[in-house]
């Protein structure tokens, strides 16, 4: 393990870089458990989750830390200094291992780059002068005592600070004992800064801000250079206006934040324009919370805070964490600079899902004849882990054969108000596919998620539905089994039809016309509608093989094309049993077993002929009860 | 709204490849759905010769597809069009467009 | 392929005449096609999308209607501006097709 720095005064996760543990087994980071045995000593360590509680961490996994969530707070101690070391001391377990001691070493330091402490300096707090006025700057506003803290205690009284001023003020004067600093005498000491002697005096003349740059280092005895740290950095002086004036609130952007997470409230969220108010004097009150949440102080104990300052606010004190409802909320806030009447503010807080998913509940169907459908709520709908939000959707992977279109235009992004308006529809462009699909990314309140959506073609097919067929029969293929009339007139053309799989048993056939008309039948892989209505197709239905003689089950898969329109696929399911003498059946049969022609006394052979044999039941189909049509598709 | 520019050179040989570019500017070409490009014979009717969608895929009309390749530059904003061995009779002026806007159009001469 | 049709190929009006062109596909485009407006020289415009919705900036002159096969663009009162080719293109089925023109001009 590395050594954790840390800035003074701030709070830093634990990383992967300064704590990390393996095992030879590839252990699973949930796994690996550490368990703090002595807690460090300038600080406290956290859970990003758990910060309120204020209770000491225990234990944390290998996992947290790689999430960040793991945090080591610096509490500022009263007396100043440059460098302090702290140390960490933890078990790793990960049964069945043995356990092993690891200590992590801290180092807090003024030398680091600190975006959330841009002075080197123990205090560089800037001043507030009112307009052509004086002011002293006291080692409460600026104060170099750290870096004589980094010189042994014993040699300290030797030491100073020289502030050497690189630019001067613009707007003022500084004096020390009451003599002007000038490009000539550019030095003060932290002597005289401790002993009071410093003052800004400003010229008067307007409220712009002021301000000086100044580089410190430490001076050793006699006024000589010594090495050791030093910085240079700008003092801002904020100049007042004597007469008092209202604060002016600014807009606020809203907070977003994940259920269960924690975000410090900025400038965007609550700021005020003051001239004459420093941030420490704008206070805050909260008049109604949400329930989605609630406040909180870096270092300011358990629970919800109340009142805060603008103070608390700039330098990142302030922050929320979205323990409630995974609702938007509204912070009603009263804020006064001590001398208005307070101002009602309010901070919205946006709870966002901390995942969504893209729902699929059924691939789009297009209807054959009209090549397009509205997408639905059925193909695309977000869900997270709050009420439904208003999904916008990007295609990341267009269809192959057709196009997505809101209006009548092509378009690639469109939003869940326009899917459940029935204004986004798919459109084949290529006919010459039964189906397509295609990727969106759906995008809601912040998060991602992308889904495929699938497309079929719904034939527009009317197919028998009715009682079984006879075994070793060949029935009459015609539009009372198949019939793709409609589609031939909403196209104006002749559909055609190929099959793609099936009977199991048994074979689709093209008899001839006549008894006159020569050979047998022959093997049909395609036909068209017209090939139907002729008459000119039957259906030999087989026995299945091996097994007994009884009730069967088989069915053909066909492909539908027509001028215009896309394929579609569609299924003829049929039962088979036995053939029965007896029984009327309700398609046209060709041909009948030949056992049951021999058991009638007419051995005849079984090619099938252009009218129905001789012990065909049923010359002309009969409808069946309850009807052997049923309508595949309503347009 | 979207703007379409052609460029590329206004004379070409025979038997060689005709390459012009389309820079898009006012809309991204991985955003509007298609970019096509259209050609117009002098004093004739306008034919669509093929689009790239903004996930980059192509089609092409049947009767050029052999000759023709459109291919996209995200980082430039760009789409090209390429025209394998030309004759005289893909003399035209060539335009770039999107569902609504058209470049407004560069003659192409084949000519030795 | 579709083929487009346009009739009439040309045709002479004044300024505030009626003017109405037909587009014929050979089946049904479902709707999805386009009217275009090309001056000489120039590239042409879109006017017309989806049968019906006029594209933003286009004077309300223009109008579209028609289903299946049969499609008619018309201008309510001829302008000076207006006399130009007219151009259908549908977007039902690939390869997009245009109809031949038609030409209008002052009589």
């Known amino acids: 393990s590395q050594t954790l720095t840390v800035c003074p005064g701030s709070v830093q996760p634990l990383s992967s870089q300064t704590l990390r543990a393996s095992s030879s087994a590839g252990t699973d980071p949930q796994l690996l458990l550490y368990r703090v045995v002595r807690g460090p000593q300038l600080g406290r360590l956290f859970h990003a989750q758990q910060d309120s509680t204020g209770e000491a961490l225990v234990n944390f996994t290998q996992a947290e830390v790689y999430a960040g969530n793991i945090l080591y707070e610096h509490e500022m101690p009263p007396e100043p200094f440059w460098e302090a070391h702290d140390t960490l001391e933890l078990q790793l377990s990960s049964p069945p291992a043995r356990d092993v001691a690891a200590t992590l070493a801290v180092a807090v330091s003024f030398e680091a780059a600190c975006p959330q402490r841009p002075s080197h300096l123990w205090k560089n707090k800037g001043l507030w002068v009112p307009e052509g006025q004086r002011a002293r700057i006291t080692v409460a506003a600026l104060d170099a005592s750290n870096l004589l803290a980094s010189v042994p205690s014993p040699q300290r009284s030797e030491h100073d600070v020289l502030f050497q001023v690189t630019q001067f003020p613009s707007r003022g004067q500084l004096l020390v004992s009451e003599e002007p600093l000038h490009a000539g005498q550019p030095h003060f000491l932290q002597s005289q800064l401790a002993a009071g002697q410093l003052v800004y005096a400003h010229g008067g003349g307007g409220t712009q801000q002021d301000g000086f740059h100044f580089r410190a280092h430490l001076q050793g005895p006699a006024g000589a250079s010594v090495a050791g740290p030093q910085t240079s950095e700008a003092f801002a002086i904020t100049v007042r206006d004597v007469n008092e004036r209202p604060p002016q609130p600014q807009a606020s952007v809203p907070l977003r934040l994940t259920r269960g997470s924690r975000a410090p409230i900025s400038r965007a969220q609550l700021s005020v324009v003051d001239p004459d108010s420093a941030p420490g004097e704008i206070e805050y009150e909260v008049q109604r919370a949400p329930h989605n949440g609630f406040l909180s102080l870096v270092g300011g104990g358990l629970g919800p805070v109340t009142r805060f300052t603008q103070a608390d606010v700039d330098s990142g004190r302030l922050a929320f964490v979205a323990n409630g409802s995974s609702v938007a909320g509204i912070f009603q806030l009263s804020m006064s600079d001590g001398a208005s009447p307070p101002l009602p503010m309010s901070l919205a807080v946006d709870i966002l899902p901390s995942a969504i998913e893209v729902q699929l509940r059924a691939p789009l169907e297009v209807p054959q004849a009209l090549g397009r459908s509205s997408l639905s709520q059925q193909q695309l709908r977000v869900v997270s882990d709050r009420e439904e939000p208003e999904a916008a959707y990007r295609l990341i992977q267009g269809p192959q054969y057709g196009h997505l279109l809101v209006g009548g235009r092509p378009t690639s992004a469109f939003s869940q108000f326009q899917i459940d308006q029935g204004e986004v529809v798919f459109a084949f462009t290529n006919f010459s596919s039964s189906h397509d699909h295609f990727r969106v990314l759906a995008l809601a309140r912040g998060v991602n998620a992308s889904a495929v959506v699938n497309v079929t073609v719904r034939a527009l097919l009317h197919v028998w539905a009715g009682g079984p067929w006879p075994q070793g029969a060949t029935l009459r293929l015609d539009p009372t089994v198949l019939d793709a009339g409609e589609l031939a007139n909403r196209t104006g053309s002749v559909p055609r039809f190929r099959l793609l799989e099936g009977p199991r048993h048994g074979r689709v056939v093209r008899v001839p016309r006549a008894r006159t008309e020569p050979g047998g039948s022959q093997l049909v892989e395609q036909f068209t509608q017209q090939d139907l209505e002729d008459g000119r197709l039957g259906l030999e239905v087989g026995r299945p093989e091996g097994r007994a003689p009884g009730p069967a089950g088989d069915s053909l898969t066909l492909e539908l094309w027509a001028q215009g329109v896309p394929p579609a696929v569609a299924s003829l399911d049929f039962a088979t049993e036995p053939y029965n003498a007896a029984r009327p059946y309700s398609v046209a049969l060709l041909s009948v077993p030949e056992a049951a022609r021999t058991e009638a006394g007419k051995p005849e052979s079984s090619t099938p002929t252009g009218e129905p044999g001789p012990m065909a039941s049923s010359p002309e189909p009969a409808v069946a009860k309850g009807g052997f049509l049923s309508f595949l598709e309503a347009n | 709204q979207v703007q379409l520019q052609e460029s590329g050179p206004g004379l070409v040989k025979p038997s060689q490849t005709l390459s012009l570019t389309c820079t898009v500017s006012?809309?991204?070409?991985?955003?509007?759905?298609?970019w096509n490009w259209i050609r117009q014979h002098p004093g004739k009717g306008l034919e669509w010769i093929g689009y790239?969608?903004?996930?980059?895929?192509?089609n092409y009309n049947p009767s050029l597809k052999s000759r023709v390749t459109i291919s996209r530059d995200t980082s430039k904003n760009q789409f090209s069009l390429k025209l394998s061995s030309v004759t005289a009779a893909d003399t035209a002026v060539y335009y770039c467009?999107?569902?609504?806007?058209w470049g407004q159009g560069t003659l192409v001469t084949v000519s030795s | 392929d579709i083929q487009m049709t346009q009739s009439p190929s040309s045709l002479s009006a004044s300024v505030g005449d009626r003017v109405t062109i037909t587009c014929r596909a050979s089946?049904?485009?479902?709707?999805?096609l386009n009217w275009y407006q090309q001056k000489p020289g120039k590239a042409p415009k879109l006017l017309i999308y989806?049968?019906?919705s006029l594209h933003s900036g286009v004077p309300s002159r223009f109008s579209g209607s028609g289903s299946g096969t049969d499609f008619t663009l018309t201008i309510s009162s001829l302008q000076p501006e207006d006399f130009a080719t007219y151009h259908c293109?549908?977007?039902?089925?690939?390869?997009?097709?245009f109809g031949q023109g038609t030409k209008v001009e002052i009589k």
């Open positions: 989806y049968t019906s």
């Open positions: 790239i969608t903004y996930d980059g895929s192509n």
């Open positions: 293109q549908q977007y039902s089925a690939l390869p997009w097709t």
């Open positions: 089946y049904g485009i479902r709707g999805y």
């Open positions: 006012g809309g991204s070409i991985t955003s509007g759905y298609y």
């Open positions: 467009a999107d569902f609504d806007y």
